[in-house]
């Protein structure tokens, strides 16, 4: 598979999100073959004592609240949806344009990413990988991710890649076997990789393309739905560039428990028109033949 990795950080909270096209986030539902492993909470360092430029495209989260600069108590209990809609393919993305000015540290906002997938029938789930590293002053889009059909509250080891589901109706298998999660090299030159694309008169940052196909399936949560996940990343480009001294190396910080957040999905058919309105703004919408992944970080 081809790997283009972008390390995304928000206010010294470094998140490395690996999103294979049509990937599946492991679901440790009850299974005779594979007992549910007991894993610790995903931890995420979060020094919250400085302001950073906020750039990129973010979906407005009306219910979100800013992080207190002096507070590290933002354990977020995520609730994956029980009943996302099953539409096929084509879905639009509403983006909030950010000018890149320095502002107070807020909770990571979502951006909707739409990645193009070539093979439609795969069911997939996007999972947020939260890394115990810090990177300061890079534009910080957080991936808003549409996924489906699995309870995903178990943590995922650092630097691990997700595996896509190429068999929608197969039984769950153990994703966490040694050979199913290749390590991501932790190289310094990979910590700040910006892949710029140009789509519909907009320059996009943080392109992540993965094609990794393995059989994997998860039982849906109550009322859950299967979805197609094909993505083309659509991010607003900030016109501000980074200063060299704004990029810092990765460092270990105090660990704060953080659970996986809610996953939700919608998939649409080619001829379908998807209308998405954010609570406070209406933006032009980007359409693709596939469904975006949405990962929502909630920090009370």
């Amino acid at each position: 598979y081809e790997t283009k990795m972008d390390l995304v950080q928000t206010s010294e909270v470094m998140q490395e999100s690996l999103y294979p096209a049509a990937q599946l986030c492991p679901s440790f539902e009850e299974s005779e073959a594979t007992p549910s492993p007991v894993l610790p909470d995903i931890v995420m360092e979060a020094p919250l004592n400085s302001a950073v430029p906020s750039a990129g495209a973010s979906v407005i989260q009306p219910s979100s609240s800013p992080l207190e600069a002096s507070s590290v108590n933002y354990e977020s209990i995520k609730h994956e949806p029980e009943n996302p809609p099953p539409y096929e393919e084509a879905m639009s993305v509403s983006l909030k344009k950010v000018s890149g000015i320095k502002e107070e540290i807020k909770e990571p906002e979502n951006i909707n990413a739409a990645l193009q997938e070539t093979e439609a029938p795969y069911i997939s789930i996007a999972c947020d990988l939260i890394k115990e590293t810090k990177l300061s002053a890079e534009p910080a889009p957080d991936f808003s991710d549409y996924s489906e059909m699995a309870k995903v509250e178990q943590p995922v080891p650092d630097h691990s890649e997700l595996v896509e589901d190429s068999s929608p109706d197969s039984e769950p298998v153990d994703l966490f076997s040694d050979d199913s999660i290749p390590d991501v090299p932790q190289k310094q030159d990979e910590t700040v990789m910006l892949v710029k694309e140009s789509l519909t008169e907009t320059s996009f940052e943080s392109m992540i393309e993965y094609e990794n196909k393995e059989k994997l399936s998860a039982l849906p949560p109550e009322g859950g739905k299967p979805y197609l996940e094909s993505f083309k990343l659509s991010l607003d480009n900030t016109k501000d560039t980074l200063l060299p001294d704004e990029v810092s190396t990765l460092s270990k910080k105090e660990k704060i428990p953080l659970q996986m957040e809610e996953l939700s999905t919608a998939v649409y058919s080619n001829d379908d028109l998807f209308i998405s309105k954010e609570a406070q703004i209406r933006e032009t919408e980007t359409f693709s033949d596939s469904s975006p992944i949405e990962i929502i970080d909630e920090f009370p």
Epitope: P81, Y87, A90, K225, L228, E278
Partner: antibody
Framework: EVKLLESGGGLVQPGGSLKLSCVVS????????MSWVRQAPGKGLEWIGE????????NYTPSLKDKFIISRDNAKNTLYLQVSTVRSEDTALYYC???????????WGQGTSVTVSS | DVLLTQTPLTLSITIGQPASISCKSS???????????LNWLLQRPGQSPKRLIY???KLDSGVPDRFTGSGSGTDFTLKISRVEAEDLGLYYC?????????FGGGTKLEIK
């Protein structure tokens, strides 16, 4: 016991606006997509739109996208529907719905009636 | 939008007799995941709609087994093996495979 209780309906003049509410109990509102569906007198059901659990994604049926704004307050377990510039054809029973396409039961409120008349 | 056409518009059935309602879609409701997201709803007089069947043929809990759903692609059928008095009302098919969700126009089941 699952309950979806709509309110806010009533008589409204053409060109006016109103905000419908739906208070939910009996299931985890924060984990559910929610929808609004309406039914004009003697007519069939019409899907208005839906909102995902954290309000980051809101879908509307294309022909109605400029008339309605769906929102929610998870702290209050409440779903909202803002109806703007109402016309006579907006006269209907408005249902709050927890739609489910597989496995779990879906839930419908009892509906709140909106009458547009001068 | 996907158009769901229900026939007949009205169905007058004697209690104990079978009934059949058709729902035809303007395009296939088969999802790429292999599932077909078609629900059947019953709206009894003065009540809210209630789902009877999901995924074409799966009965909701509490729904009598005299109701059966069948079909694939664009043609779907709801059958009642023996109509009972409580079955009267409006029946709707409802698709979720394509955006936006759409309902059929409804079929009114009357008791003779």
């Amino acid at each position: 016991e699952v309950k979806l209780l709509e309110s806010g309906g009533g008589l409204v003049q053409p060109g006016g606006s109103l905000k419908l509410s739906c208070v939910v109990s009996g299931f985890d509102f924060r984990r559910n997509w929610m929808s609004w569906v309406r039914q004009a007198p003697g007519k069939g059901l019409e899907w208005i739109g839906e909102i995902n659990p954290d309000s980051s994604k809101i879908n509307y049926t294309p022909s109605l996208k400029d008339k309605f704004i769906i929102s929610r307050d998870n702290a209050k377990n409440t779903l909202y529907l803002q109806v703007s510039t109402v016309r006579s054809e907006d006269t209907a029973l408005y249902y709050c719905v927890r739609p489910v396409w597989m496995y779990a039961m879906d839930y419908w409120g009892q509906g709140t009636s909106v009458t547009v008349s001068s | 939008d996907v158009l769901l056409t229900q026939t007949p518009l009205t169905l007058s059935i004697t209690i104990g007799q079978p009934a059949s309602i058709s729902c035809k879609s303007s395009q296939s409701l088969l999802h790429s995941d292999g599932k077909t997201y078609l629900n059947w709803l019953l709206q009894r007089p003065g009540q809210s709609p209630k789902r009877l069947i999901y995924l074409v043929s799966k009965l909701d809990s509490g729904v009598p087994d005299r109701f059966t759903g069948s079909g694939s692609g664009t043609d779907f059928t709801l059958k009642i093996s023996r109509v009972e008095a409580e079955d009267l009302g409006l029946y709707y098919c409802w698709q979720g495979t394509h955006f936006p969700q759409t309902f059929g126009g409804g079929t009114k089941l009357e008791i003779k």
